[in-house]
Interface confidence: low
């Protein structure tokens, strides 16, 4: 009696199941009681000898490519052996690699967590994912896993992490890169500093006093508000960052505390107060301001 090994499918894709069947075309199963065993190269597969002429392999991988055969043994211990069948497991190369960010959009607050998610639309087997910083490609990390997605995490983002990133995926057919993703690190404003600038050392009534407010850190645009006591004098915007100024024509009523506030949508900070006093120096005929 002749024995045949049939693999279904005969050309499996990586990760897919395969059923091996040991066929005996000229013998009915009722003719004799058989035990079956399946082999790859020189190694027995699955449970070893079994009464089932089928062996289900849940997932085939590239390394499972090889020469397969089966044996059947009668109760009288006569062993039949099939011819060897070559099973080639097909690997799907990676394609359509993309890099996504969490949070989405690539905008992240300083100190927050950033995850760079590299994924492929297709690809089987062990895929190596590599993450790069900057268009020149400073290598950050590599991971090899049997998955279409892998993550690289920056637990606490710093200003220096604001860069372009890309990832590369590879599973034996050459590297496939994603597009570049820009990361913007959003920095809340620091406490602003208020400076008073007058045209002379001792400003007089009707002089123009410049109130200059500046937060040394913070993502633009920054909106500055200027206050005299608790009264709003006005606001100025700094679209590209830096400071902003507000001009005031002095009168005697302008004595008191001045402050400013910086706000870039990520939080607001108020400066320390600066006090202005009118004084009348001895022998002088006009009022002067001191701070």
């Amino acid at each position: 009696a002749e024995l045949f090994l049939i693999a279904s499918p005969s050309h499996p894709t990586e990760g897919s199941p395969v059923t091996l069947t040991c066929k005996m075309p000229f013998l009915q199963s009722s003719d004799a009681q058989f035990q079956f065993c399946f082999f790859r190269d020189t190694r027995a597969l699955g449970p070893g000898w079994s009464s089932s002429p089928k062996l289900q392999i849940a997932a085939m991988w590239k390394e499972d490519t090889g020469s397969y055969w089966c044996e059947a043994q009668t109760m009288a211990s006569k062993v039949l052996r099939s011819r060897r069948s070559q099973i080639n497991v097909h690997r799907v190369p990676v394609a359509d690699v993309s890099l996504e960010t969490q949070p989405p959009g690539g905008q992240v607050m300083e100190g927050d967590r950033l995850v760079l998610i590299c994924s492929v639309a297709m690809g089987t087997g062990d895929i190596t994912f590599l993450w790069y910083k900057g268009a020149v490609g400073l290598n950050l990390q590599s991971k090899t896993q049997r998955s279409l997605t892998a993550e690289y995490e920056i637990p606490s983002v710093r200003e220096s992490d604001a860069e372009q990133y890309y990832c590369v995926a590879e599973n034996g057919y050459g590297p496939s890169p994603s597009g570049l993703v820009s990361i913007t690190v959003r920095i809340p404003v620091s406490r602003p500093i208020l400076m008073l600038r007058a045209p002379r050392a001792q400003a007089a009534v009707e002089d123009v006093l410049e109130l200059h407010c500046e937060a040394l850190r913070g993502s633009p645009p920054i909106l500055y508000w200027f206050y005299h006591e608790d009264i709003t004098l006005g606001s100025r915007s700094a679209p590209s960052g830096g400071g902003a100024s507000f001009n005031l024509s002095l009168t005697e009523e302008h004595s008191g505390n001045y402050s400013c506030e910086a706000n870039n949508g990520l939080g607001a900070q108020r400066s320390e107060a600066v006090t202005l006093n009118f004084t009348v120096p001895t022998g002088a005929r006009s009022n002067h301001l001191t701070s």
Epitope: E100, P104, I117, M122, L148, Y173, G174
Partner: antibody, heavy 117, light 112 residues
């Protein structure tokens, strides 16, 4: 067996938004990307975008980028496509389609969206 | 974007005769690493969603009759229906998936 079941037909006014759902069953939702394709009456097929339900990452056709949002809810195995600022030329049948090794092997039944004042 | 161009736009064939649809891409869909072409063919009947027929340019999807075959490589591809049946009346689309998906404009197949 694999099934993609989409929400029912919608009639919308110009300027409004529409959100179409696509419920997947019969397979592991997070293992396959989901694409959205539309077809205007008597016209061909036009790719709108896709989502990887595993990561939530999406990619869009530049033509729709500012108006389309594709999301996925893994707890219910449902993908969503929202199109905003609707105009009459957005009248079409919208399909979701599962992707297996690049090709779209299973499609939803389609959702007709009519934009009319 | 990769542009896919089908020809002809429509085709009338007698029952039992061969139908041939061509598809041309604006850039090669062949991956040299695995010698596979990233191209699919779909059939769409009125009121129905498209149905996948062929992927990798020449691999028939499970359950698709063997009268449907795909061939070609690089930028030029062909879908052949060896013996047209009444149920094959439909619009056929090619689609590349080497990049973000794009479809051909479609070819309408009718019975002569």
């Amino acid at each position: 067996q694999v099934q993609l079941v989409q929400s029912g037909a919608e009639v919308k006014k110009p300027g409004a938004s529409v959100k179409v759902s696509c419920k997947a069953s019969g397979y592991t939702f997070t293992r396959y990307w989901m694409h959205w394709v539309r077809q205007a009456p008597g016209q061909g097929l036009e790719w709108m975008g896709r989502i990887d339900p595993n990561s939530g990452g999406s990619k869009y056709n530049e033509k729709f980028k500012s108006r389309v949002t594709i999301t996925a809810d893994t707890s219910t195995s449902t993908a969503y496509m929202e199109l905003s600022s609707l105009r009459s030329e957005d009248t079409a049948v919208y399909y979701c389609a599962r992707v297996n090794s690049g090709a779209m092997d299973y499609w939803g039944q389609g959702t007709l969206v009519t934009v009319s004042s | 974007d990769i542009v896919m161009t089908q020809s002809p736009d429509s085709l009338a064939v007698s029952l039992g005769e061969r139908a041939t649809i061509n598809c041309k891409s604006s850039q090669s869909l062949l991956y040299s690493s695995n010698q596979k072409n990233y191209l699919a063919w779909y059939q769409q009947k009125p009121g129905q969603p498209p149905k996948l027929l062929i992927y990798w340019a020449s691999t028939r999807e499970s359950g698709v009759p063997d009268r449907f075959s795909g061939s070609g490589s690089g930028t030029d591809f062909t879908l052949t229906i060896s013996s047209l049946q009444a149920e094959d009346v439909a619009v056929y689309y090619c689609q590349q998936y080497s990049n973000y998906p794009t479809f051909g404009q479609g070819t309408k197949v009718e019975i002569k």
